[in-house]
């Protein structure tokens, strides 16, 4: 008799896939440009990166580090009008794109949640999920809470409003602590909780030590749903050097949890190319055009439109693994078993049920190497077969679609490798 | 018990600006909302605007420029300033409370004041 | 701005008759997000303030007698009252109170009793 499939977990909508960060409209936008009514027509670009939501903003009213001229209610003007909002709303949910609005109060100001009237401050976020929440927004995000004091039970508060009005609406709350404890604390009080912080910021030195910060954090959360990311904002470039970018892609969209990218991360966006461009939010490269304070400074592959037309591009590979990410049983909500592969590599599977299962092996060291897997590791439930077959490489040159012996699997420099095989009884 | 009264001048004399006090008890202006709503002799009603616990106000956008509404906590008192009056504007003013999580309903109203515009 | 509309104007009934009083939203009143119906029915006596009955389109307010029923989604809704009592004449308001404001009043319907 055929064994009995395993129930499958209720999934929520941000269990399916990535988010995508806009925190500057104008920066995401260029070309002097920078509001909801010009982001309305961007969200076909999205869609194309197969995000499953949008966390905009913060686009509230709000004078530099002053509470009263501080509206979360108002739509700052620059950025558009409620109906500008509303509308961008309508055409985000035709195409299946959820929009989560950050109310970061003082975001143009020095303290976040400014550093007195902490109690009116909370009132206001209050007011601002209420009112949002019966406007249509799926979600919302509050930054820099290591800024706010008694910031879990604030946290515990404003979920209970949100999960009050739908189980289906999100809150994200965004440190930037790197601090495990800290963030466990955070964590503990508030469940459903969607946590970005800077956690796995310094994770880029070598792979036993990111394996030993992921598997860490995968046992201290237990069965909780995660976010990946570098940093509650921040650009992937930020902390990464460029021959790393793919490689993390690779992980962040195979690790178990959401995904939480920057806008400009699928690209390689890069600050400190672009000379005068704020390290934060520099301008979104969509073609050559985009940045034309320096003629000759961008070149086409740094642009969405020349990565566009080339398949081994990080665009790519971003759309690629955005896609696996959102339909693949075992990347959306499968089980996690992290396994020795030698020194310098991390390495994993992906599993659920009798699905087709994933095998993940990262390099993040400068030389190439033979990866020892140490099937030993894995439970039964996970074993390795001998033989899986290559989904991609984040390097060119490899023949996709191959089978590719285990035993023998050998490694570029920052290669990363998405292997598939099939469950066998 | 949830108590609201409005205390107004009676009578103003066109393009002159109207002050309408509303006083509650019984809860907090920290954690309600008050609406203020006019009715017109024998008429419907009209909603004119919100102001928040947190002290965001929504405005009916056909008479924004020459509402303001305001409030003091302390004091649990909340303001309707209307400026530039004409005799349309005569009506029964009322102040009531945003009473529901995730609705705009109003669950407790003062009694009104009647306000005249009238030379 | 959303247009609420009410019919009919006036109605007259004896006690005891049940009555159904109709209004209707220029755009629907649904909200997808939580599946609540933004639609207010509100009571108001002669010389009395309005007095909340329903929200969120058949969600009876505390304290109000049960021969109050609201129905409908979408654009179309209905106040019935079961049993008409001596004490329920009154103009009777619908409200929307979808998202944005103005949350705007239907033109009210008024209940007279033979």
């Known amino acids: 008799r055929a064994p009995r499939c395993r129930e499958l977990p209720a999934q929520k909508w941000w269990h399916t896939g990535a988010l995508y960060r806009i925190g500057d409209l104008q920066a995401f936008q260029g070309h002097g440009a920078g509001n909801l009514a010009g982001l309305k027509g961007r969200l076909d670009y999205l869609s194309s990166l197969k995000v499953k939501g949008l966390v905009l903003g913060p686009i509230h009213k709000n004078q530099k580090d002053d509470v009263a001229q501080t509206d979360l209610l108002q739509i700052d003007p620059n950025f558009g009008s409620k109906e500008d909002f509303d509308s961008l709303l309508q055409s985000a949910k035709k195409k299946s794109i959820r929009v989560i609005l950050d109310l970061t109060p003082n975001y143009r100001g020095e303290n976040s949640w400014f550093s007195t009237q902490v109690d009116t401050v909370a009132t206001k976020v209050k007011d601002a999920l209420e009112f949002w929440l019966q406007a249509g927004v799926d979600g919302f995000q509050v930054r820099d809470i290591e800024n706010l004091k008694d910031a879990s039970s604030f946290l515990a508060e404003w979920q209970n409003i949100t999960k009050g009005f739908s189980e289906d609406r999100l809150l994200i709350a965004g440190t930037n602590s790197s601090d495990l404890q800290q963030i466990l604390s955070l964590l503990e009080s508030n469940k459903d909780l969607l946590l970005t912080s800077s956690y796995l910021s310094d994770s880029g030195s070598t792979g036993e030590h990111t394996k030993s910060l992921v598997t860490q954090y995968l046992n201290a959360t237990g069965n909780r749903w995660c976010s990946w990311s570098l940093s509650q904002a921040r650009l992937l470039t930020s902390f990464l050097p460029a021959q790393l970018l793919r490689l993390y892609q690779l992980m962040l969209f195979t690790l178990p949890g959401t995904p939480v990218f920057s806008y400009g991360d699928e690209i390689g966006l890069d600050a400190a190319a672009l000379p005068g461009q704020p390290m934060e939010a520099p301008v979104m490269l969509w073609d050559e055009s985009s940045f034309p304070d320096i003629p000759g400074a961008v070149s086409a592959n740094m642009t969405v439109k020349g990565q566009s037309e080339d398949p081994g591009s990080l665009l790519s590979l971003f759309r690629r693994l955005s896609d696996q990410r959102s339909k693949e049983r075992s990347l959306l909500h499968g089980d996690f078993h992290a396994f020795s592969a030698g020194p310098g590599l991390f390495s994993y599977i992906r599993h659920w049920d009798q699905n087709e299962r994933f095998l993940v092996v990262l390099n993040f060291g400068d030389v190439g190497l033979s990866a020892g897997l140490q099937a030993s590791d894995l439970p039964a439930s996970a074993s390795l077969p001998a033989k899986a077959d290559l989904l991609l490489s984040t390097q060119p040159g490899r023949e996709e679609g191959s089978p590719l012996e285990l035993e023998r699997l050998k490694l570029e420099p920052h290669e990363g490798l998405l292997l598939r095989f099939p469950y066998a009884a | 018990q949830v108590q609201l009264k409005e205390s107004g001048p009676g009578l103003v004399a066109p393009s002159q600006s109207l002050s309408i006090t509303c006083t509650v008890s019984g809860f907090s202006l920290t954690s309600y909302g008050v609406h203020w709503i006019r009715q017109p002799p024998g008429k419907g009603l009209e909603w004119l605007g919100l102001i928040w616990a947190g002290g965001s106000i929504n405005y009916n956008s056909a008479l924004m420029s020459r509402l303001s509404i305001s409030k003091d906590n302390s004091k649990s008192q909340v303001f309707l300033k209307m400026n530039s009056l004409e005799t349309e504007d005569t009506a029964m003013y009322y102040c009531?409370?945003?009473?529901?999580?995730?609705?705009?309903?109003?669950?407790?109203w003062g009694q009104g004041t009647s306000v005249t515009v009238s030379s | 701005d959303i247009v609420m509309t009410q019919s009919p104007s006036s109605l007259t009934v004896t006690a005891g008759e049940k009555v159904t009083m109709s209004c209707k939203s220029s755009q629907s009143l649904l909200n997808s997000g939580n599946q609540k119906t933004y639609l207010t029915w509100y009571q108001q006596k002669p010389g009395q303030p309005p007095k909340l009955l329903i929200y969120?389109?058949?969600t009876r307010e505390s304290g109000v007698p049960d021969r109050f029923t609201g129905s409908g989604s979408g654009t179309e809704f209905t106040l019935t009252i079961s049993s008409v009592q001596a004490e329920d004449l009154a103009v009777y308001y619908c409200q929307n109170d979808y998202s944005y404001p103005p949350w705007t009043f239907g033109g009210g319907t008024k209940l007279e009793i033979k």
């Open positions: 969120w389109a058949s």
């Open positions: 009531a409370r945003k009473g529901h999580m995730y609705s705009y309903a109003m669950d407790y």
